[in-house]
């Protein structure tokens, strides 16, 4: 049987980006099940190291189980993780029944912001927004929200927040106790 081309064999290869906060550089982990041969870049344990944020890198992938042409993988390196901060934007006067969470860009970067998507999951609710506002919540309840940021559909950072809503007003408290 003839061998596939490496371009075909690795057509659907996916990548995870891992950030080093000390060096401020990324590692791209190639999600493959076998040892692969990398060109134009050196790979260690199927990882390409020392990638600069917002700078494209190209790596050609081959193996002797496949023929030319090699798979050319363009690594779209995301912005640095510390450029983003998950901020609690809940208004104090509404903190008993609402939660507001917002991703803030706290430093500039050169990546195309159009390629950045934000995702929140609070309980079984999913939101694809940079900011979420949950309303009509129970006072004095804990709510957990998980969030992630994706660059060109690759997750590169995530955060979780557990927020406890404030005590309700005395009137609300009376009503809730009567309901019990």
């Amino acid at each position: 049987p003839s061998k596939p081309t490496c371009d075909e064999k690795y057509a659907n290869i996916t990548v995870d980006y891992l950030y080093n906060k000390e060096t401020k550089l990324f590692t791209a982990k190639l999600n493959v099940n076998e040892n692969v041969e990398c060109g134009n870049n050196t790979c260690t344990n199927n990882e390409v190291h020392n990638l600069t944020e917002c700078k494209n890198a190209s790596v050609s992938i081959s193996h002797n189980s496949c023929t030319a042409p090699d798979k050319t993988l363009i690594l779209d390196v995301p912005p640095g993780v510390e450029k983003f901060q998950l901020h609690d934007c809940t208004q104090v006067e509404k903190a008993d029944t609402t939660i507001c969470l917002k991703w803030k860009n706290i430093e500039t970067f050169t990546c195309d912001t159009q390629n950045i998507t934000y995702r929140f999951q609070c309980g079984n609710m999913i939101f694809d927004n940079k900011e979420i506002k949950l309303e009509n919540l129970e006072p004095e309840h804990e709510y957990k929200c998980d969030s992630e940021i994706l660059y060109n559909n690759h997750k590169f950072t995530n955060a979780s927040k557990i927020i406890k809503t404030d005590f309700g007003s005395p009137e609300q408290k009376l009503i809730s106790e009567e309901d019990l």
Partner: nanobody, 123 residues
Framework: QVQLQESGGGLVQPGGSLRLSCAAS????????MGWFRQAPGKEREFVSS????????YYAGAVRGRFTISRDNAKNTVYLQMNSLQPEDTAVYYC????????????????WGQGTLVTVSS
């Protein structure tokens, strides 16, 4: 038929360094992924490091990553293992091996093996 011959083993103190070499003959060296394995007394043979045909891709076992460096010189038909910060637990017979398929780092993936060179780390 590929023949492999390791050299460079010996006795070294903890924290010391050694460089192992593996010379290949009898085949086209650049057709093979190369690996280093080790076997300590009473233990199974374990993967240490491997390197692709061109040398652009390398793999390390967790226990040696950051301390050992694999390299190859296709013009000299030789693969090297530079071992730094050696510890008593690195004591073993080190084997060089060649694989034409080089799909993973399992010893069964490698068709050709050297005789081994003994590395002893002791004060």
């Amino acid at each position: 038929q590929v023949q492999l011959q390791e050299s460079g083993g010996g006795l070294v103190q903890p924290g010391g360094s050694l460089r192992l070499s593996c010379a290949a003959s009898g085949g086209t060296f650049s057709d093979y992924g190369m690996g280093w394995f080790r076997q300590a007394p009473g233990k199974e043979r374990e993967f240490v490091s491997s390197i692709s045909w061109s040398g652009n891709s390398v793999y390390y076992a967790g226990a040696v990553r950051g301390r050992f460096t694999i390299s190859r010189d296709n013009a000299k038909n030789t693969v090297y293992l530079q071992m730094n910060s050696l510890q008593p637990e690195d004591t073993a017979v080190y084997y060089c091996a060649a694989s034409s398929t080089w799909n993973n780092n399992d010893p069964t993936e490698y068709e050709y093996w050297g005789q081994g060179t003994l590395v002893t780390v002791s004060s």
